[in-house]
Interface confidence: low
Amino acid sequence: ECVTQLLKDTCFEGGDITTVFTPSAKYCQVVCTYHPRCLLFTFTAESPSEDPTRWFTCVLKDSVTETLPRVNRTAAISGYSFKQCSHQISACNKDIYVDLDMKGINYNSSVAKSAQECQERCTDDVHCHFFTYATRQFPSLEHRNICLLKHTQTGTPTRITKLDKVVSGFSLKSCALSNLACIRDIFPNTVFADSNIDSVMAPDAFVCGRICTHHPGCLFFTFFSQEWPKESQRNLCLLKTSESGLPSTRIKKSKALSGFSLQSCRHSIPVFCHSSFYHDTDFLGEELDIVAAKSHEACQKLCTNAVRCQFFTYTPAQASCNEGKGKCYLKLSSNGSPTKILHGRGGISGYTLRLCKMDNECTTKIKPRIVGGTASVRGEWPWQVTLHTTSPTQRHLCGGSIIGNQWILTAAHCFYGVESPKILRVYSGILNQSEIKEDTSFFGVQEIIIHDQYKMAESGYDIALLKLETTVNYTDSQRPICLPSKGDRNVIYTDCWVTGWGYRKLRDKIQNTLQKAKIPLVTNEECQKRYRGHKITHKMICAGYREGGKDACKGDSGGPLSCKHNEVWHLVGITSWGEGCAQRERPGVYTNVVEYVDWILEKTQAV
C-alpha cells in the first residue's frame, strides 16, 4: 500500500537498519526510498524539547509486515518509503536549507558570488555530494562568500547543525544538470587499479555499472566476469574512486571489464532497472518466500509485486511436475545484490522491476520497430504528438514530443499567429490523423513557453514548451523520449529518424499516417557550406542525404529528430527549417536540443 503523507509527532518503534542525517523529513523519505531495504523511517525535526544531537536524524527502518508500532513523540516525523508506490520517483533535490550546516569532508573551499553558484560548482564537481555556503552576513569576515564542497561515504551529511547566516544544499547531478562528461563505454580486458570503496556481486558489467552509478562514492568500476581465472572473484563488481576522479592505472587483464559511473547521464539511461534475465544462473541471498510460478517472467512479476523482494531465482519444473509450474525463490540482501552468483545449476535469475520507477520513464524499452517502409506502426514513436489548432478550422499545426507528463517540446515558429493557448489541442498516441474525431480525447494547453531569444526559425532558438492542462498517463502508445545528456555532446549518433504527418512534397497535403525517415546527421561545417546565406550555429544540428530525397517538410515542424543510442531513444533535434524539402545538398536544419537542456529544465522544473 502506498502511503505518501508524513505522520507528525509520530515515531515508528524498532526495525532500525541505520541512521543518517537529512535536512528535512521529505528528504529522509527520498533516502529511505533509495535504500535497498528501507520501508519506513522516523525523522527528528529541530525542537526545544529534543536533544540537539538528535536533530535532523533520519532512522531508516525495515519490517517483515511492512509496518511498525507507532508511538507519540513531539518533533518526530515518520512515514513510508515510496517503494510501495507506483508513481515516478526522483532523487533530485533543489531545496536550499537556510541556517543549516551540513557536515562532511570539506575537500574544496573557494569564493562564490552566491549560493546558486556554489551549488553549480558542486553539481559540476565529480566528488561533491552537498555544499555549505557562508553568506555575506556571516559573522566571520574571512569566511564570507566561502563555498565549501563536501562529500561523505553515504552521500548524506555525517551531521547537521544550526549555524546562522549559512545555507546548504545538495548537488544537482540527479536533476540532470551536471556538465560532467558522460562516458558510456565499457572497456573490455581492462582492470582499473584504484582503491575500492565497496564490492558487490553482479551478473554482468552492465549491472555493475548501474550499481556504480547509484552508489554515492563510486566514480568507476571493474567487473570480473564468470570466466575470470580466480574463482572466488568471479562476478565480483569492484566500486572504485580516486582523487582525480579518473582511474590512475589501467591494467590489461583478460576476462575483466571496466567502466565509469553514469551519474551525469543517469536521467537518460536506466540505472536502477535491471530488466534482463540470466539463464543458467542462480542468485543467492536471504530467502523471502518460495512460490510456484509458470515461467521466469511470472517469477519476476511476483518479485516485483513483493515490496521486500530484490532479486529472484526461478527453477523450471521437472516434466509433468506440479502442473508444469517451477519454483520461484524470492530473495533479498542487505545491499540489494546477490551475496553469491552460481552458474551451471539450471536456474534463471533476475531482479525486481519495482525500482524501474526510480529511472526516468523515457528509458523504458519500446516495442521493436518495423524497419523499412515510410509509414509508421502504432506505438513505434510513442513520444510523437500531433498539435492541432481549432482556428479558423481544426487542423494539424505541428508535431511535438512528450518529454514529461505535463510537457511537450516543439518549435517556436509553430506559434506564429497563435494568440492564445486556448485554440490548441495536443493529441497523443495517434497513428492516423483520421482517428481524430470530435469526441477524441486531447490535452488542452495551459501555457506556451517560447524561448525569449526566438525571432525566426533561421536565426535559431526555435524551441518552445507546451505545459498541458492535465497530466499524461504513460502507456505503450504515449510515453516520453529522453533528452540528450549534456555530457553526451560528443556522441556521434548513427541511428536517427525524423517523423511527422507533414507533406511528402511541396504543395502536398498533411499525411494521414505518421511517416518516418531514417536520416544521417551532417556536420555543422558541411551544413554551413550548404547554407552560405545563413549562420548555422552550434545550437542547430543538420540532417539529410547529400542527394536529397528524404527530409522533413511542411507540417513536420516541431516534431522530433529521434536518435537511438545504447538502446535508448534521445530527442536530438526539433524539426525547424530548411530550403525546400528533400532537395539535393540542402539538409534539414533542426534545433540542437542538447544546447537547450538547461533552458528546458529551468522551465519545466520551476516551482
Partner: nanobody
Framework: QVQLQESGGGLVQPGGSLRLSCAAS????????MSWVRQAPGKGLEGVSG????????HYADSVKGRFTISRDNAKNTLYLQMNSLKTEDTAVYFC??????????????WGQGTQVTVSS
Amino acid sequence: QVQLQESGGGLVQPGGSLRLSCAASGFTFSNYDMSWVRQAPGKGLEGVSGINSGGGHPHYADSVKGRFTISRDNAKNTLYLQMNSLKTEDTAVYFCATDEGERYGEDFGYWGQGTQVTVSS
C-alpha cells in the same frame, strides 16, 4: 490587427469558373508568401496553391494543375485564385493564408475565415 478576407465563392456547375479574392490588411502584404488552402466536407486540409512575396514561383497541388491560377496584386494587397474547369471534388471551404515557407507547420501564420465553393449540377 491582421485581417484576411476571402470573397468570390458560391455555387457553380461542373466545368464552370470562379475567381476568389483575398483582401489583406494589418501587415505588410508584399513581404509575405501567400497560399490558398481548402477543406472539403469531412476531409483534412489540402494546400491548393502558393505564391512567393514578389508574385513568382507559383505552386499547385497535382489535383488542380492546369485548371487553377494563383496571382497577387501587391499594390492592392490582394491575393487571387482563378478556378476554371471546376469539378465536384473541388467543393470545399477555401482559405487564404500567409505562408511561412516550406516546413513551417501547417500553421501558415494568419488565416482568413474562408469562402464556400460548391460545385454541383
